[in-house]
Amino acid sequence: VEVKVPTEPLSTPLGKTAELTCTYSTSVGDSFALEWSFVQPGKPISESHPILYFTNGHLYPTGSKSKRVSLLQNPPTVGVATLKLTDVHPSDTGTYLCQVNNPPDFYTNGLGLINLTVLVPPSNPLCSQSGQTSVGGSTALRCSSSEGAPKPVYNWVRLGTFPTPSPGSMVQDEVSGQLILTNLSLTSSGTYRCVATNQMGSASCELTLSVTEPSQGRVA
């Protein structure tokens, strides 16, 4: 049996229904069987777990996703073995295997792989600060969302009116969410906002930096 699946990965927003397309061509016999299984990201295919079987004219959902899986066409004997997964969770991200068996059609292995990513908006990030907050010192402002798929990008902005910082005194890394402030001055004091963004949305946190004379330094 030759199985056809999309070549591009599938992305589905959190809570929505994922349709994992799988089609095939074979003269369906009584021994026809379909199995859908799931493997977590980074795990080998050999560690896949079955989530649905169809055999002898009956459908058998199984495992932790059993209440949320069904077939687009039941019975799946018309050439369409597409799986529907409702109310997708972040833990549904991974590789799905569609395997069709129909003896004596052994021309190919009857296996198709689909990568699913569940899209999750960034959670409210946590803003933190470390380093010397005295004049002339350096500090790092950090921002991190515990949730978000694809991984959020981070952008720091200083709120309010302030003089333009000298070149190189503010360097940010959109991937790590870190903002490095060097050669601090009293005018570096203020509120900094970090916005975490991906295609599903954005979330932010704020941090107030107080730059002090060399004898003292603190963050409010």
Epitope: S25, S27, G29, V80, P104
Partner: antibody, heavy 118, light 107 residues
């Protein structure tokens, strides 16, 4: 030599019923998916029903679903098509065909003519 | 449903001609296409399956090609026995459908 011989065609009134038969020989019937394909006079081919090797799965196009029933008797190497609620547009030559491992039709019978007319 | 469209509907040719018939599918059917030959008053005969595979006994002057949505049946040198009607059929997902046919007649 593969042989498929249809019978049971004839003249029937609209709304009437007819049962076609197909006697198979020259191959292992119980291992083969089978179909009926029809051809209206002067027209093209239309697949109308299929059945899996042991009869567990049957399929139909929308044009005949609910009116036609395909069945088989592997002990007799026979295929059947029960046609109910016949319409004028069902008038055609009905062919019995064997399916290959993929669903193309590698052997065909000579056909039997069904005429639906008042 | 997948629609199959053949062109031309009729083709006039002479013995020895190279003849090409086209079949288009309304959506991607990969290589799941068969071709049949039918003579008047006779049942169809399988010529090609999986777009390009010839069953045993089909003369090598017949060849099939294509994938996706566009397919061709070529007769490299038309013989007197080849004047007939030719049909394409997809063998992908149910319902399996046929093209409307191409009649190859003597010029």
């Amino acid at each position: 030599e593969v042989q498929l011989v249809e019978s049971g065609g004839g003249l029937v009134k609209p709304g009437g019923s007819l049962r076609l038969s197909c006697a198979a020989s020259g191959f292992t019937f119980s291992n083969s998916g089978m179909s009926w394909v029809r051809q209206a006079p002067g027209k093209g081919l239309e697949w109308v029903a299929s059945i899996s090797d042991g009869g567990l799965y049957t399929h139909y196009p929308d044009s005949v679903k609910g009116r036609f029933t395909i069945s088989r008797d592997n002990a007799k190497s026979s295929l059947y098509l029960q046609m109910n609620s016949l319409r004028a547009e069902d008038t055609a030559v009905y062919y019995c065909a064997r399916q290959g491992v993929r669903p193309f039709f590698d052997y065909w019978g000579q056909g039997t003519l069904v005429t639906v007319s008042s | 449903d997948i629609q199959m469209t053949q062109s031309p509907s009729t083709l006039s040719a002479s013995v020895g001609d190279r003849v090409t018939i086209t079949c288009r599918a309304s959506e991607n059917i990969y290589s799941y296409l068969a071709w049949y030959q039918q003579k008047p008053g006779k049942s169809p005969k399988l010529l090609v399956f999986n777009a390009e595979t010839l069953p045993e006994g089909v003369p090598s002057r017949f060849s099939g090609s294509g994938s996706g949505t566009e397919f061709t049946l070529t007769i490299s040198s038309l013989q007197p026995d080849d004047f007939a009607t030719y049909y394409c059929q997809h063998h992908y997902v149910i319902p399996w459908t046929f093209g409307q046919g191409t009649k190859v007649e003597i010029k």
